[in-house]
């Protein structure tokens, strides 16, 4: 049962009072207000929005609301020297140029300061050369090209379709393959759902629509010039040559009309199989270069973007806890957008705004949460999670001692089919219990719980009768809290039906067409899915901040640790001979997982039996729960990724968006058969097993009786 107890207030001020105060009409109104002009990070418009949110959060009743500013490296196109791509003939004449901007959506023709499509942090350059089509530019795509097809990308410009993995990983892979430039495009196979019209008549991507986005490989560093430390007034900044994660080759995104013009001329090798074909009427030849008649033509990139140290602003609101003010539950989401941000981020920011308003209403009636709640409107998320990371770097000592949980609040919707949750196993029970108490907004599930519709539409692949809850990866503002600091984290949003809609993300992601009207007309006219997401996010925050005993269940960590140990062992056993030769044993890890399981169960027994009226014992038990996630942090970090310090989870080295379990062991095993020094490679596997086993055992011991 949820405890839902309130502090110093009448019994009516419980979770129900908080949830009942959340209104769909308010979320709709806030979304409209946040999406009328662009709010690009580092611009005056986004600074003004920060001040507006600060003022409104104060009006809503928060105890304090401050702006926290940092001077970080951002990237912008050159206003007078636009970026584009050409096809040039043998004389160097440009016979085709890609478009310089997206055709604006109806009603927005006169809006100024719409940033044209660009790949943030691309270096300047004008490379020219033959084109190679590299599918999604995933690790496995380059393996196919280089190992199976013997195609060399060195000195070539590669063209890759968006989707499947984070764009920064695509660029990194292209760099490693020796490419001298990257063209990213949205293929209709991934960004045009069959049977749906293009915007403004539907939610599909028109041919002139383009996905913006950063192409960094920061690995959790935050501002590229001040890794590990806040970009404050007295910061020491690295030189640009030493900056973290910047790409070394020019990169530019285009839409599928322009991509058609480049791809239709491709010659060379045929695509290796159907998985390399998109939906354009082109052969999807891999190249290199154009076919017969066009073989003397080349592709030329013209990139003139600049990197600039620019001021950004987070808004930090505080609702002080009545009993444990030194314990922080954080709800955070970003405010900066590429253009209008109709979905990303403002569908999330509008929900946060309404959650703040509801909490403020309760506070004005005399209520306070047990623990302190911090609300954050992050800046520069789109430029590499910079606002959240800099703030966490500045406040890391407080956070590691006082941080109970972080709930992320970016886009509330990426579809309108069912709930999607990624979180620490500590929150599984909380999410299950909460969704059982909430009404489903789904058609056909009237009078049924959200848990029921979610479980029916998105069943767990491993555990029947339960909903799917995914591992946390990255690509959003929870990263620093979870992967670096080890603060229990979670995120929730409404999503599409992944079975029937195989496109990546939502079609209009990071385009100019991500408007208020997109949401209001096509995704959520009644704002009922937004309201449900507000209830899930807000309900989690309420329970985390207000329950007497923290709503974390360490037994669920035991369950997943066993699953992950089984999985990584199975991967390793694909090399039985090497396992024997190099005496690789997983016994220590399996033993540690068993010990964790045993200790976690005994802890749970004590948790049910202890005297909750004894504040010292209560605090002690809660601290053991709070610090469990912290116990999975290795202060030395993962190999070559010092800011990814969680031993159980890290963003995949091949896709920042995805989470990988036992990432140290996984990466040590990855493609191990191709390593030049197998003895050294298997030695690293053994070292990573040792680190994982030690960490799991050490975490288990934090749950043991203290004396």
């Amino acid at each position: 049962k949820s405890s839902n107890e309130a502090t110093n207030i009448t019994p009516k001020h419980n979770m129900k009072a908080f949830l009942d105060e959340l209104k769909a009409e308010n979320i709709k109104k806030f979304l409209y207000n946040f999406t009328q002009i662009p709010h690009l990070a580092g611009t005056e418009q986004n600074f003004q929005l920060a001040k507006q949110i600060q003022s409104q959060w104060k009006e809503f009743g928060l105890d304090s609301v401050e702006l926290a500013h940092y001077d970080v490296l951002l990237s912008y196109p050159n206003k007078t020297h636009p970026n584009y791509i050409s096809i040039i003939n043998e004389d160097g004449n440009e016979i085709f140029n890609t478009s310089l901007f997206e055709p604006p959506p109806p009603g927005y023709e006169n809006v100024s300061d719409i940033v044209p499509p660009f790949s943030a942090f691309s270096p300047q350059g004008m490379p020219e050369g033959d084109l190679v089509y590299v599918n999604y530019a995933r690790t496995e795509d380059f393996f196919k090209l280089e190992r199976d097809m013997k195609i060399n990308c060195s000195g070539k410009i590669v063209i890759a379709r968006y989707g499947k993995v984070f764009r920064g990983n695509k660029v990194k892979n292209a760099q490693l393959a020796g490419a001298k430039g990257v063209i990213l495009y949205s293929d209709p196979a991934d960004y045009f759902a069959p049977g749906v019209k293009s915007y403004p008549d539907g939610w599909n991507l028109p041919g002139g629509g383009v996905q913006r986005g950063n192409i960094l490989n920061l690995n959790g560093a935050g501002d590229p010039l001040t890794p590990g430390y806040p970009a404050n007034e007295y910061a020491y900044r690295r030189g640009i040559a030493e900056a973290v994660g910047l790409p070394s080759i020019p990169v530019h995104p285009i839409g599928y009309y322009d991509a058609q013009k480049l791809l239709e001329k491709m010659g060379g090798s045929a695509p290796p199989d159907s998985s390399w074909r998109g939906s354009l009427k082109v052969p999807y030849n891999v190249g290199p270069g154009f076919t017969g008649n066009f073989s003397t033509q080349k592709v030329k990139m013209h990139i003139h973007s600049t990197n600039e140290v620019t001021r950004i602003y987070n808004v930090i609101g505080t609702l002080r806890g009545a009993v444990e003010p030194d314990r922080y539950v954080i709800l955070g989401g970003h405010r900066d957008s590429w253009v209008f941000g109709g979905i990303d981020p403002q569908s999330g920011a509008a929900v946060v705004h309404e959650i703040v308003r509801s909490f403020g209403t309760l506070k004005k009636e005399g209520w306070r949460p047990r623990r302190t709640i911090l609300f954050a409107s992050w800046d520069a998320e789109e430029f590499g999670l910079l606002g959240s990371t800099e703030w966490a770097e500045e406040n890391s000592r407080l956070l590691q001692e006082r941080g109970v949980a972080y709930i992320n609040a970016d886009s509330s919707i990426e579809g309108n089919y069912t709930l999607r949750v990624d979180c620490t196993p500590l929150m599984y029970s909380l999410v299950h219990n909460l969704t059982k108490e909430l009404k489903s907004p789904d058609e056909g599930f009237e009078g049924k719980s959200l848990y029921e519709s979610w479980t029916k539409k998105s069943p767990s692949p491993e555990f029947s009768g339960m909903p799917r809850i995914s591992k946390l990866g990255s690509g959003n503002d929870f990263e620093v809290f979870f992967q670096r600091l080890g603060i229990a984290s979670g995120r929730a949003r409404y999503t599409k039906n992944w079975e029937t809609n195989k496109f990546s993300g939502y079609p209009l992601y990071h385009s100019v067409y991500e408007t208020y009207e997109l949401v209001e007309k096509f995704y959520d006219p009644m704002f009922k899915y937004h309201l449900t997401v507000a209830q899930v996010r807000g309900g989690m925050v309420f329970e985390l901040a207000n329950s007497i005993v923290l709503p974390f269940d360490c037994r669920d960590y035991a369950v997943v640790l066993r699953k992950y140990a089984d999985k990584i062992y199975s991967i390793s056993m694909k090399h039985p001979q090497e396992m024997k030769t190099y005496s690789v044993s997983f016994d220590s890890l399996f033993s540690a997982v068993k010990n964790f399981t045993e200790i976690a169960s005994k802890f749970s027994e004590r948790l049910q039996d202890f005297d909750k009226s004894n504040p010292i014992v209560l605090r002690m038990m809660n601290d053991q729960l709070m610090f469990l996630e912290r116990a999975f942090i290795d202060p030395l970090g993962l190999p070559d990724r010092p800011f990814y310090r969680h031993v159980i989870y890290a963003p995949s080295s091949h896709n920042k968006y995805a989470g990988e379990s036992f990432p140290g062991i996984y990466d040590a095993l990855f493609d191990i058969e191709s390593k030049v020094d197998p003895s050294k490679a298997w030695g690293e596997v053994k070292r990573q097993i040792y680190v994982a086993a030690f960490t799991v055992q050490a975490a288990a011991e934090t749950l043991s009786e203290v004396a």
Epitope: F463, M466, R555, A558, S570, E605, Q608
Partner: antibody, heavy 121, light 110 residues
Framework: EVQLVESGGGLVQPGGSLRLSCAAS????????MSWVRQAPGKGLEWVSA????????YYADSVKGRFTISRDNSKNTLYLQMNSLRAEDSAVYYC??????????????WGQGTLVTVSS | QSVLTQPPSVSAAPGQKVTISCSGS????????VSWYQQLPGTAPKLLIY???KRPSGIPDRFSGSKSGTSATLGITGLQTGDEADYYC???????????FGGGTKLTVL
């Protein structure tokens, strides 16, 4: 003292359903994985299903996947096995067993006395 | 057909020693902990050995367990007529995500 008492067995026709219960006492029920293990007459032990402590993650033998559902009610200290689309080969004594370690199955330190399920027309 | 392989039967005279083998693979016995159960005629199984070689309280030290590679062994010394029973090995299988048992071994005390 740990006690596990199964009930709900009986005679059922092929294609029919039955719900088994296991009442547990003498330990903190919610903290331990619980399993159902069956034994056909004159045959060996066959693990059927398990449910973890905590959120109640479930595991099934291939032979019963999609037909049987394990669940638990921690407030009632009771384990259940809902058996649908029963077949003759499901006839067995069904034992409820407690895990000896914690939230996932390692070994069974306590067993109930079993309840007989007979599937026959 | 069981995932773990046991001999169908073993026999020995009272006072003698007997061993029962249990053979598996890298995904079960090879990496996971083995337990052994005794089932006397007409009764529920009872835990005899856990974690490869540990005895629950009340189990005499005549019973022992060991594991090597992908095989496990149950040893019984000083056989008594009361030891006549079926013996089962069990473990977790990391590939199947399932508990697996051996087919059982009938011990006859001659």
């Amino acid at each position: 003292e740990v006690q596990l008492v199964e009930s709900g067995g009986g005679l059922v026709q092929p294609g029919g359903s039955l719900r088994l219960s296991c009442a547990a006492s003498g330990f903190t029920f919610s903290s331990y994985a619980m399993s159902w293990v069956r034994q056909a007459p004159g045959k060996g032990l066959e693990w059927v299903s398990a449910i973890s402590g905590g959120s109640g993650s479930t595991y099934y033998a291939d032979s019963v996947k999609g037909r049987f559902t394990i669940s638990r009610d921690n407030s009632k200290n009771t384990l259940y096995l809902q058996m649908n689309s029963l077949r003759a080969e499901d006839s067995a004594v069904y034992y409820c067993a407690k895990d000896g370690v914690g939230a996932t199955p390692y070994y069974f330190d306590y067993w109930g006395q079993g309840t007989l399920v007979t599937v026959s027309s | 057909q069981s995932v773990l392989t046991q001999p169908p039967s073993v026999s020995a005279a009272p006072g003698q020693k007997v061993t029962i083998s249990c053979s598996g693979s890298s995904s079960n016995i090879g990496i996971n902990y083995v337990s052994w159960y005794q089932q006397l005629p007409g009764t529920a199984p009872k835990l005899l050995i856990y974690d490869n070689n540990k005895r629950p309280s009340g189990i005499p030290d005549r019973f022992s367990g060991s594991k090597s590679g992908t095989s496990a062994t149950l040893g019984i010394t000083g056989l008594q007529t009361g030891d006549e029973a079926d013996y089962y090995c069990g473990t977790w299988d990391s590939s199947l995500s399932a508990v697996v048992f051996g087919g059982g071994t009938k011990l006859t005390v001659l």
